[in-house]
C-alpha cells in the first residue's frame, strides 16, 4: 500500500503556546477498493502527534511594592524607599528596568548627630580622623586634609630623602565586589605612610619605593616563563561556573554561600567572576551544543600582603561609614557594598592575566578525532606560535591535519566559533588587540610583548585573597552597631545574587542570576535560549535538585542560637538526578541588642555604651523645662536650657510623634514649638472579667497582633475566643459582660479521669458518639495507624483514648496548623516510642525530656542543662554544624530538639570512638 495516496491533513494548532505542547494530524482516508486490497488499514498510520512550542514560557520580572519611606536622614537630608525583586525575568520575559531604591530630599525631624571619634590623647584632624601625635609636623600629609601640618614651627622629616610611592599602590586599597567579580571604590588609603620610613627595592629601577603603612610586605618580581600557559577543557559551562575545588564561596557570618564562576586563579582561595564575560559565554552556548577551551597565563609585577589590623581607611570610605545611621536602613547600608564592594584585598599580586575562552561546536570537536587532552595541547601549541611567538615551538602533525584544522588552513584555533576575552591588566587598546576574532589573519609579532610591557604601568590586582569589608569597620564611633548592621545588610544584599529565585531550567540546565534576569547554563548536549534543545546523543532525563531560597531567621532561642532553613525543591531531584549539596538548615549565634525599644544604641569597639550628657548650665538666662504633649516626654531632660538649644519630644511606648518634634529655646525664655502630639499606634490590653485569661498577656499589642481568651479548667468562653488589634481597637469588639460557662465535658466527668464519666459509683469510658455532641475545645491529634494528623474535639479524643486507642497522640491544643508547634508535636511523637518515662498530664503524656506543669497540666520541655545524666536510652549524635560526634541521652536529645536546635541522630547507643 502506498500510504501517501491518502494525504495528511494540516497539523492541528498546538495545545500550548509554550512549555511543550502537542499537535496532531490525520490521514484523509477513503475506504476504496485499493485501500482494502492492499491491506492499507494494517500498514498505514492514521494519526501522528509531535511536540510543538517547546520553548519555555517567558517569566516577566516582577517587582514588589515600595516599602514606606525611611526616616529622614538628618545628615544628608534624604529619605529612601526600597522594593525587592519578587521574581526575576527568565526565558525571555520582560526585564525590570525601574530602580529598586528611590531617594528624595526631605526635611528632617531629628538633629544630625554624627558621633565624633573620641581622639583622647591623639591628634584630631579637621576631617574628624584621629592620628598619632608623632605624625604632627613631619612634613607629610597624614590627615589627608593637611591639617596635621598647619601652624608648624619646625618640621621633622620622616625620611632623609624623598621616595616615590609604589606604582599603582592605590589598586591594592580598592574594595572588591565578590558577587560581581570586580574592583570598586577605595577602602584603604595606601598613600598614608604612618610616619615610618620603610622602603622596598625593585630590580627595574634604581630608586627604592616608599611602603605604605597598610602593607605588611611588598616583593617585586616579573614572571614571564614561556611554558606556563595553562589550558582547561569544559564540556559545558556548568563546570566552569561550578568548579568544586575552585568555587568562590563566601559565607557571611552564617549567611548563605553563593557560588560564582571563577575565571582565573592559581590560588584556590581566589574568587573572581567576570559577570559580563560569563553572560557572553552563556549566550554563545545557547546557539549550539558547545564545548569550551580556556587558555591562560599569569604575569606578576609584584606581590603584596596587607597588615592584619590597625588599617588606615580611605577618607571617602571613612566618611561613608560615619554617615551611616545607627538605626538599620537597608538602602543606606547596602549602598556601601555597591560603592565599595563586599571585600578588601588581604594579599595578592599586581600584574596581568592573558586569558581567553574559546567556544567550539561539540559536534565538530567530536568529529575532529582528537581527545580532550589533544585538543588542549593543540590550543596551547598554536597560542605559543601565533600569539606569544615562541621561536622553538614544534607544531605537531595531529594539530594541523585533523578534520577541524583542515577546514581552516591547518589552524585549530580558527575552527572555534568565537572567543571571549577575559584578559586583565595592561593598556586596554593592547588587551583588545590580543582578543581573537574568527577569520582574522592572526596577531602581529609585537602585540603580546606590547601588552606585556604595558602591564607594568597598568597592572590589575590578580591572584588575590579577600576578607569581608565589614572587618574594616573598627575604631570608628559606634563600630559594633555599624558592623552588626552591615552584616545584616550583607545577608540581604547577597540574597539578591542567589539563583534560588529562578525557575528550574529545562534539560537540567543550571540557573544563574544576572542582575534581575535568570539565565540558564546548559548541560553538555543541550542548547537553545533556555537549554530546551537536545542534541541527538543527549539521552538523560535526570533532574538535579536545586535549593529554594532560605527562610527568614528564626528568633533567638534559649541556647543563644537562631536558625533558618531551605528546601531542595527548586526543583527536587528526579529520575536519578543529584541531591542538593550543602546544608538544609543553618544555625548561628545571636547578636543581642541591649536596648530593646530605645532605638539602636551606639556601641563602640570597647563595648562601652556611650551616653552623651549635655553639661549642666549654671547661667540663669535661658528657658525652664517645657511641658511635653500628653503621652510624651522630653528626651534630654534638665532644669534649664540655654538660648538656641533644642529639646526633642519623644512619645511613650505605643505612641508615635506626629508633627515637628523639636522645641527651641528663645532669648525671651519661651519655647518656639510647632504642633506636635503623641498618637496611639497600639491597642491597650482589654479589660475583661477576672475569670478570663488573656494570652499573650501584654500591656500593649501592635496592629495585627491577636489575643485569645481562655477559662479555668472545666469552663469555656461564652463567646469568640480570638480578637485582633486593628487601628487602635479590638475586632470583634470585646464585650464587658463576656464570661465563662461550665464545660459540659467537666459536668459529665464528675470525679473520674478525663475521658471517663460517672456511672453510679463507677467510672466508665465516655462514648465518642453519645457523650460528645456538646462543644469541647479543639485539639490537634496524631494517629500513628494512618500516620496522619487532624483536628479533633477534646471530648472525642479523650473518649477514644480511654477506649484504649493507643495510636492516638496529643500534639497541641487548638486546631492543627502548619508551623513549629505542629512540627515539634510530630517529632516528639516519634521520639516518644523510646521514652522511659510516660506520665499522664491533662490531655497529654509527658516524656523523659519534659515536666508536667501542676498549674496548667501541660508538658513543658526541660532545658538541656536540666537533664539528668545517664539512662539506658543513649544516642550518638552530631550537633549543629559541628562535625564531632557526641553521646547524649534521650532527655538531652528531646530538650535540644524542643529548643529547635539542630541535632542529627547517627545511631542509637554510645558513640564508638
Amino acid at each position: 500500500c502506498f500510504c501517501d495516496h491518502y494525504p495528511w491533513s494540516q497539523w492541528s494548532s498546538c495545545s500550548k503556546t509554550c512549555n511543550s505542547g502537542t499537535q496532531s494530524r490525520h490521514r484523509q482516508i477513503v475506504v476504496d477498493k485499493y485501500y482494502q486490497e492492499n491491506f492499507c488499514e494494517q500498514i498505514c498510520s492514521k494519526q501522528e502527534t509531535r511536540e510543538c512550542n517547546w520553548q519555555s514560557c517567558p517569566i516577566n520580572c516582577l517587582l514588589g511594592d515600595f516599602g514606606p519611606w525611611s526616616d529622614c536622614d538628618p545628615c544628608v537630608e534624604k529619605q529612601s524607599k526600597v522594593r525587592s525583586v519578587l521574581r526575576p525575568s527568565q526565558f525571555g520575559g520582560q526585564p525590570c528596568t525601574e530602580p529598586l531604591v528611590v531617594f528624595q530630599p526631605c526635611i528632617p525631624s531629628k538633629l544630625c548627630k554624627i558621633e565624633e571619634a573620641d581622639c583622647k590623647n591623639k591628634f584630631r584632624c579637621d576631617s574628624g580622623r584621629c592620628i598619632a601625635r608623632k605624625l604632627e609636623c613631619n612634613g607629610e600629609n597624614d590627615c589627608g586634609d593637611n591639617s596635621d601640618e598647619r601652624d608648624c614651627g619646625r618640621t621633622k622629616a620622616v625620611c632623609a630623602r624623598k621616595y616615590n610611592p609604589i606604582p599603582s599602590v592605590q589598586l591594592m586599597g580598592n574594595g572588591f565586589h565578590f558577587l560581581a567579580g570586580e574592583p570598586r571604590g577605595e577602602v584603604l588609603d595606601n598613600s598614608f605612610t604612618g610616619g615610618i620610613c620603610k622602603t622596598v627595592k625593585s630590580s627595574r629601577t634604581s630608586n627604592p619605593y616608599r611602603v605604605p603603612a597598610n602593607l605588611e610586605n611588598v616583593g617585586f618580581e616579573v614572571e614571564t616563563a614561556e611554558d606556563d600557559l595553562k589550558t582547561d577543557f569544559y564540556k559545558d559551562l556548568t563546570s566552569l561556573g561550578h568548579n568544586e575545588n575552585q568555587q568562590g564561596s563566601f559565607s557571611s557570618q552564617g549567611g548563605s554561600s553563593f557560588r560564582v564562576p571563577i575565571f582565573y586563579s592559581s590560588k584556590r582561595s581566589e574568587n573572581v567572576n567576570h559577570n559580563s564575560a560569563f553572560k557572553q559565554a552563556i549566550q554563545a552556548s545557547h546557539k549550539k551544543d558547545s564545548s569550551f577551551i580556556r587558555i591562560h597565563k599569569v604575569m606578576k609585577v609584584l606581590n603584596f600582603t596587607t597588615k592584619a589590623k590597625d588599617l588606615y581607611l580611605s577618607d571617602v570610605f571613612l566618611k561613608a561609614l560615619n554617615h551611616l545611621p545607627l538605626e538599620y536602613n537597608s538602602a543606606l547600608y547596602t549602598r556601601i557594598f555597591d560603592d565599595f564592594g563586599t571585600h578588601y584585598f588581604t594579599s595578592g599580586s599586581l600584574g596581568g592575566v592573558y586569558d581567553l575562552l574559546y567556544q567550539f561546536s561539540s559536534e565538530e570537536l567530536k568529529n575532529s578525532g582528537l581527545t580532550e587532552e589533544e585538543t588542549k595541547h593543540c590550543v596551547r601549541i598554536e597560542t605559543k606560535k601565533r600569539v606569544l611567538f615562541v621561536k622553538k615551538t614544534k607544531v605537531e602533525h595531529r594539530c594541523t591535519t585533523n578534520k577541524l584544522s583542515e577546514k581552516h588552513e591547518g589552524s585549530f584555533l580558527q575552527g572555534a566559533e568565537k572567543s571571549i576575552s577575559l584578559i586583565r591588566g595592561g593598556r586596554s587598546e593592547y588587551a583588545a588587540a590580543l582578543a581573537w576574532e574568527k577569520g582574522s589573519s592572526g596577531l602581529e609579532e609585537k602585540t603580546f610583548s606590547d601588552w606585556l610591557e604595558s602591564v607594568k604601568e597598568n597592572p590589575a590586582v590578580i591572584d588575590f585573597e579577600l576578607a569581608p569589608i565589614v572587618d574594616l569597620v573598627r575604631n570608628i564611633p559606634c563600630a559594633v552597631t555599624k558592623r552588626n548592621n552591615l552584616r545584616k545588610a550583607f545577608q540581604e544584599y547577597a540574597a539578591k545574587f542567589d539563583p534560588c529565585q529562578c525557575a528550574p531550567c529545562p534539560n537540567n540546565g543550571r540557573p544563574t542570576l544576572s542582575g534581575t534576569e535568570c539565565l540558564c547554563v546548559c548541560q553538555s548536549g543541550t542548547y537553545g535560549e533556555n537549554c530546551e534543545r537536545r542534541s541527538p546523543d543527549y539521552k538523560s532525563n535526570a533532574v538535579d535538585g536545586h535549593w529554594g531560597c532560605w527562610s527568614s531567621w528564626s528568633t533567638c532561642d534559649a541556647t543563644y542560637k537562631r536558625s533558618r532553613t531551605r528546601e531542595c525543591s527548586n526543583p527536587a531531584p528526579k529520575r536519578g538526578g543529584k541531591r542538593c549539596e550543602g546544608e538544609k538548615r543553618q544555625e548561628e549565634d545571636c547578636t543581642f541588642s541591649i536596648m530593646e525599644n530605645n532605638g539602636q544604641p551606639c556601641i563602640n569597639d570597647d563595648e562601652e555604651m556611650k551616653e552623651v550628657n549635655l553639661p549642666e548650665i549654671e547661667a540663669d538666662s535661658g528657658c525652664p523645662q517645657p511641658v511635653p504633649p500628653e503621652n510624651g516626654f522630653i528626651r534630654n531632660e534638665k532644669k534649664l536650657y540655654s538660648v538656641g538649644e533644642d529639646v526633642e519630644i519623644s512619645c511613650l511606648t505605643g505612641f508615635e510623634t506626629v508633627g515637628y518634634q523639636y522645641f527651641r529655646c528663645l532669648p525671651d525664655g519661651t519655647w518656639r514649638q510647632g504642633d506636635v502630639e503623641c498618637q496611639r499606634t497600639e491597642c491597650i490590653k482589654p479589660v475583661v472579667q477576672e475569670i478570663l485569661t488573656i494570652t499573650p498577656f501584654q500591656r500593649l499589642y501592635r496592629i495585627g497582633e491577636s489575643i485569645e481568651l481562655t477559662c479555668p479548667k472545666g469552663f469555656v468562653v461564652a463567646g469568640p475566643l480570638r480578637y485582633t488589634c486593628q487601628g487602635n481597637s479590638w475586632t470583634p469588639p470585646i464585650s464587658n459582660s463576656l464570661t465563662c460557662e461550665k464545660d459540659s465535658l467537666t459536668k459529665l466527668k464528675g470525679h473520674c479521669q478525663l475521658g471517663q464519666k460517672q456511672s453510679g459509683s463507677e467510672c466508665i469510658c465516655m462514648s465518642p458518639e453519645e457523650d460528645c455532641s456538646h462543644y469541647s475545645e479543639d485539639l490537634c491529634v496524631f494517629d500513628t495507624d494512618s500516620n496522619d494528623y487532624f483536628t479533633s474535639p477534646a471530648c472525642k479524643f479523650l473518649a477514644e483514648k480511654c477506649l484504649n486507642n493507643q495510636q492516638l497522640h496529643f500534639l497541641h491544643i487548638g486546631s492543627c496548623q502548619d508551623g513549629r508547634q505542629l512540627e515539634w508535636g510530630l517529632e516528639r511523637t516519634r521520639l516518644s516510642s523510646n521514652s522511659t518515662k510516660k506520665e499522664s498530664c491533662g490531655y497529654d503524656t509527658c516524656y523523659d525530656w519534659e515536666k508536667c506543669t501542676a498549674s496548667t497540666s501541660k508538658c513543658a520541655c526541660l532545658l538541656p542543662p536540666q537533664c539528668f545524666k545517664g539512662g539506658n536510652q543513649l544516642y550518638c549524635v552530631k550537633m549543629g554544624s559541628s562535625t564531632s560526634e557526641k553521646t547524649l541521652n534521650i532527655c538531652e536529645v528531646g530538650a535540644i530538639r524542643c529548643a529547635n536546635r539542630k541535632v542529627e541522630i547517627l545511631h542509637p547507643g554510645k558513640c564508638l570512638a
Epitope: C556, F592, E596, W824, K851, L863, P865, Q866, K869, C898
Partner: antibody, heavy 118, light 112 residues
Framework: EVQLVESDGGLVQPGGSLKLSCVAS????????MAWVRQGPTKGLEWVAT????????YYRESVKGRFTISRDNAKRTLYLQMDSLRSEDTATYYC???????????WGHGTLVTVSS | DVVLTQTPSTLSATIGQSVSISCRSS???????????LYWYLQRPGQSPQLLIY???DLGSGVPNRFSGSGSGTDFTLKISGVEAEDLGIYYC?????????FGAGTNLELK
C-alpha cells in the same frame, strides 16, 4: 541534702587572675550540669557560665568569653572557675549552682566575694 | 539581651497583707512550642537566692502556697497572699526563654 560550698574569693588587681572552686555533696555530682552565677554591686544577678556532665561542653556569657574558664573534676566532686584578665566590673559575689527539673538554678551555694580593685 | 523590668523596686507591707510584684519583659517569653521559661526567686538578707516559682506559675518544692505566679507573653506577676515575716527580702524574676539568661533588678519587700 544538696550542699554547694564555694572557696574563698579575695581582692585581685585589674588584669589579675583568680581560681574559684565549689565542692558539692548530697547528690551524684557527675550526673548534673553545673553553673556559676554572680551578683555584682551594680549589675544585679548575672549568669556567668555553664558546664555539662563531663566538661566536654561549656557555655559563657559574652562579656567573660575568652577570659573565664569553667571546668570540673568529677572525682573530686568539684566545680572550678578560672578568672583571668579581671576587670573592675567583675567585682561580685560568685555563686555555684545546680539545676533540677524545676529550674536551671535550683540549688545555690552560699557565695564568695571577689573584689577587683587597684 | 532580654531586659526584665520589675516594679515596684521597693515594696512596704504589713504582716498579713497581700502584695503583688510585676515583671515585664522587653520581648515575649513564649517560645514557638508554647513554653514560657519565667522563674521567681527570693533572696533573704545575707542568704543565697531560693527558687519560688518555675515556668510562670508552678510552685517550687517546699514553697508555701501563699505564693502564686501568673502572666504570659511579656507581663508576669508574683502574688503573696498574706505576707509573713520570713517573706522579707529581695524578689527576682528570671527568664531562660532567650539566651543569655537574664534576671530582673529585684523588688525589695520590707516591713512597713
Amino acid at each position: 541534702e544538696v550542699q554547694l560550698v564555694e572557696s574563698d574569693g579575695g581582692l585581685v588587681q585589674p588584669g589579675g587572675s583568680l581560681k574559684l572552686s565549689c565542692v558539692a555533696s548530697g547528690f551524684s555530682f557527675s550526673d548534673y550540669y553545673m553553673a556559676w552565677v554572680r551578683q555584682g554591686p551594680t549589675k544585679g544577678l548575672e549568669w556567668v557560665a555553664t558546664i555539662n556532665y563531663d566538661g566536654s561542653s561549656t557555655y559563657y556569657r559574652e562579656s567573660v568569653k575568652g577570659r573565664f574558664t569553667i571546668s570540673r573534676d568529677n572525682a573530686k566532686r568539684t566545680l572550678y572557675l578560672q578568672m583571668d584578665s579581671l576587670r573592675s566590673e567583675d567585682t561580685a559575689t560568685y555563686y555555684c549552682s545546680r539545676p533540677s527539673t524545676e529550674a536551671l538554678f535550683a540549688y545555690w551555694g552560699h557565695g564568695t566575694l571577689v573584689t577587683v580593685s587597684s | 539581651d532580654v531586659v526584665l523590668t520589675q516594679t515596684p523596686s521597693t515594696l512596704s507591707a504589713t504582716i498579713g497583707q497581700s502584695v503583688s510584684i510585676s515583671c515585664r519583659s522587653s520581648q515575649s517569653l513564649l517560645n514557638d512550642v508554647g513554653n514560657t521559661y519565667l522563674y521567681w526567686y527570693l533572696q533573704r538578707p545575707g542568704q543565697s537566692p531560693q527558687l519560688l516559682i518555675y515556668l510562670v506559675s508552678d510552685l517550687g518544692s517546699g514553697v508555701p502556697n501563699r505564693f502564686s505566679g501568673s502572666g504570659s507573653g511579656t507581663d508576669f506577676t508574683l502574688k503573696i497572699s498574706g505576707v509573713e515575716a520570713e517573706d522579707l527580702g529581695i524578689y527576682y524574676c528570671m527568664q531562660a526563654s532567650h539566651a543569655p539568661y537574664t534576671f530582673g533588678a529585684g523588688t525589695n519587700l520590707e516591713l512597713k
